[in-house]
C-alpha cells in the first residue's frame, strides 16, 4: 500500500477549492479568506484579484474561482481580463496623452474609445459623396457620377450589399 | 502593519537551553504560520520549523526535531522557540518569520533576531 | 532534504549593470521558489515568490524566471542600495530549504 501511494501524488486528490497543504502533511485544506484554486491538485491558492479604484467588481471571487472586474461609468476595458481601465471620450474625440481631443478634419470616431479613422474615400471606389462626414461619423458614398446621367434617378433603390472593396460591374 | 519583535540576546552554557520569544501584531495572530530560521555568524539561513498558532500544528527540521519545542501563547499573540542541549555549533542568530497567505511557502515578514551565544 | 545551489557565491558589479544570479534545486519544485535580500546585521527580506511574483513594495528592477530545477534572479539595473547577500528558497517540500548565499558587491 505505502509504495502503491508514494507513486500517485498526494495533491492529485485535493478538489478545486482546496490546497494540498505543504505544512500539514499534504493534506487537502481549504483554501484561506481571499484565495482561490480553480483546479484540482494545487499546492496552493491564488490569491484573489481585487478590483479596487477605477475597477469595480463584475463577479466576486469564490474559492474556486477569481474575481472579475470591470470599469467604473466613465471608463472602458483594455487587455485580456479587463487588466486596464482607459477614460471614455466622447463620439468624435480621441485619447490623447493630453488628455480628450476632437478628432482632426478628415477624421472620425463613432465610439467612446479608440482612436480617429480617416472618413472614406468614396472615389477611390467610384462612387460620390452623398453624405458629408462629421467628427463623429463617417462619409456615405452614393452612387458613381456616372449613374448620376440626366433624366436618372437620383433617389433609385440602392444596389444590393457587395464585398467591401468590389467596384460596380 | 506587521511586526514581529523577538526578545534580546541570550548567553547560554552547553548543555543549557535557551527559549527565544516572538511577539506578533499588526494581523491575525492565529491566521498565519509561524517559521523559525536560524544563521550562523557567517554562514546561511537554515529553517528549523514552524507552528500554525490556531491549533498548535507543528512541523521540525529532522536535524532539530530531538531538541526544538515550539509554543504559543495566543492571549499575548507570542510564540516560542525553545532549542535544548545546547552546543556551541548552535551559536547563531535566530529569526522567527511569518509564512505568507495563502501560502506560497514564503515567509514575508521577519523579526529582528536574537543573537543566541553559546560558550563555556 | 532538497538541496539547493546558487551561483556564483559572490560577484561584483556596477551601478546600472544587468545582475544575474542562479539557483539549483536537486529535485522539481514547480513554481515553489523565492528569493530574499540580506543586508550585514539584518533580518532578510522577502523580494519574490512563487519564482516571479514581486512583495509588495519590492522595486519593479527585481525580477525571477524559472520553473522545475532551474531559476534566474535579475537586477535590470544595478542601484548601490542593492549591496546585499541574496538567497533563494524552496517551498515546495518540507523542511524548506536555502541556498548558500550570493554576496553581491559593488565595483
Known amino acids: 500500500f505505502e509504495r502503491t501511494r508514494s507513486l500517485q501524488d498526494p495533491c492529485s486528490n485535493c478538489p478545486a477549492g482546496t490546497f494540498c497543504d505543504n505544512n500539514r502533511n499534504q493534506i487537502c485544506s481549504p483554501c484561506p479568506p481571499n484565495s482561490f484554486s480553480s483546479a484540482g491538485g494545487q499546492r496552493t491558492c491564488d490569491i484573489c484579484r481585487q478590483c479596487k479604484g477605477v475597477f469595480r467588481t463584475r463577479k466576486e471571487c469564490s474559492s474556486t474561482s477569481n474575481a472579475e472586474c470591470d470599469c467604473t461609468p466613465g471608463f472602458h476595458c483594455l487587455g485580456a481580463g479587463c487588466s486596464m481601465c482607459e477614460q471614455d471620450c466622447k463620439q468624435g474625440q480621441e485619447l490623447t496623452k493630453k488628455g480628450c481631443k476632437d478628432c482632426c478634419f478628415g477624421t472620425f470616431n463613432d465610439q467612446k474609445r479608440g482612436i480617429c479613422r480617416p472618413w472614406t474615400n468614396c472615389s477611390l471606389d467610384g462612387k460620390s459623396v452623398l453624405v458629408n462626414g462629421t467628427k463623429e461619423r463617417d462619409v456615405v458614398c452614393g452612387p458613381s457620377p456616372a449613374d448620376l446621367s440626366p433624366g436618372a434617378s437620383s433617389v433609385t433603390p440602392p444596389a444590393p450589399a457587395r464585398e467591401p472593396g468590389h467596384s460596380p460591374q | 502593519q506587521v511586526q514581529l519583535v523577538q526578545s534580546g540576546a541570550e548567553v547560554k552554557k552547553p548543555g543549557a537551553s535557551v527559549k527565544v520569544s516572538c511577539k506578533a501584531s499588526?494581523?491575525?495572530?492565529?491566521?498565519?504560520?509561524i517559521n523559525w530560521v536560524r544563521q550562523a555568524p557567517g554562514q546561511g539561513l537554515e529553517w528549523m520549523g514552524n507552528?500554525?498558532?490556531?491549533?498548535?500544528?507543528?512541523n521540525y527540521n529532522q536535524k532539530f526535531k530531538d531538541r526544538v519545542t515550539m509554543t504559543r501563547d495566543t492571549s499575548t499573540s507570542t510564540v516560542y522557540m525553545e532549542l535544548s542541549s545546547l552546543r556551541s555549533e548552535d551559536t547563531a542568530v535566530y529569526y522567527c518569520?511569518?509564512?505568507?497567505?495563502?501560502?506560497?511557502?514564503?515567509?514575508?515578514?521577519w523579526g529582528q533576531g536574537t543573537l543566541v551565544t553559546v560558550s563555556s | 532534504d532538497i538541496q539547493m545551489t546558487q551561483s556564483p557565491s559572490s560577484l561584483s558589479a556596477s551601478v546600472g549593470d544587468r545582475v544575474t544570479i542562479t539557483c539549483r534545486a536537486s529535485?522539481?519544485?514547480?513554481?515553489?521558489l523565492n528569493w530574499y535580500q540580506q543586508k550585514p546585521g539584518k533580518a532578510p527580506k522577502l523580494l519574490i515568490y512563487?519564482?516571479?511574483r514581486l512583495h509588495s513594495g519590492v522595486p519593479s528592477r527585481f525580477s525571477g524566471s524559472g520553473s522545475g530545477t532551474d531559476f534566474t534572479f535579475t537586477i535590470s539595473s544595478l542601484q548601490p542600495e542593492d549591496i546585499a547577500t541574496y538567497y533563494c528558497?524552496?517551498?515546495?517540500?518540507?523542511?524548506?530549504?536555502f541556498g548558500p548565499g550570493t554576496k553581491l558587491e559593488i565595483k
Open positions: 518569520a511569518r509564512m505568507g497567505d495563502p501560502f506560497y511557502y514564503a515567509v514575508d515578514y
Open positions: 499588526g494581523y491575525t495572530f492565529t491566521s498565519y504560520w
Open positions: 507552528i500554525y498558532p490556531s491549533d498548535t500544528y507543528t
Open positions: 529535485q522539481d519544485i514547480s513554481n515553489y
Open positions: 512563487y519564482t516571479s
Open positions: 528558497q524552496q517551498g515546495h517540500t518540507l523542511p524548506y530549504t
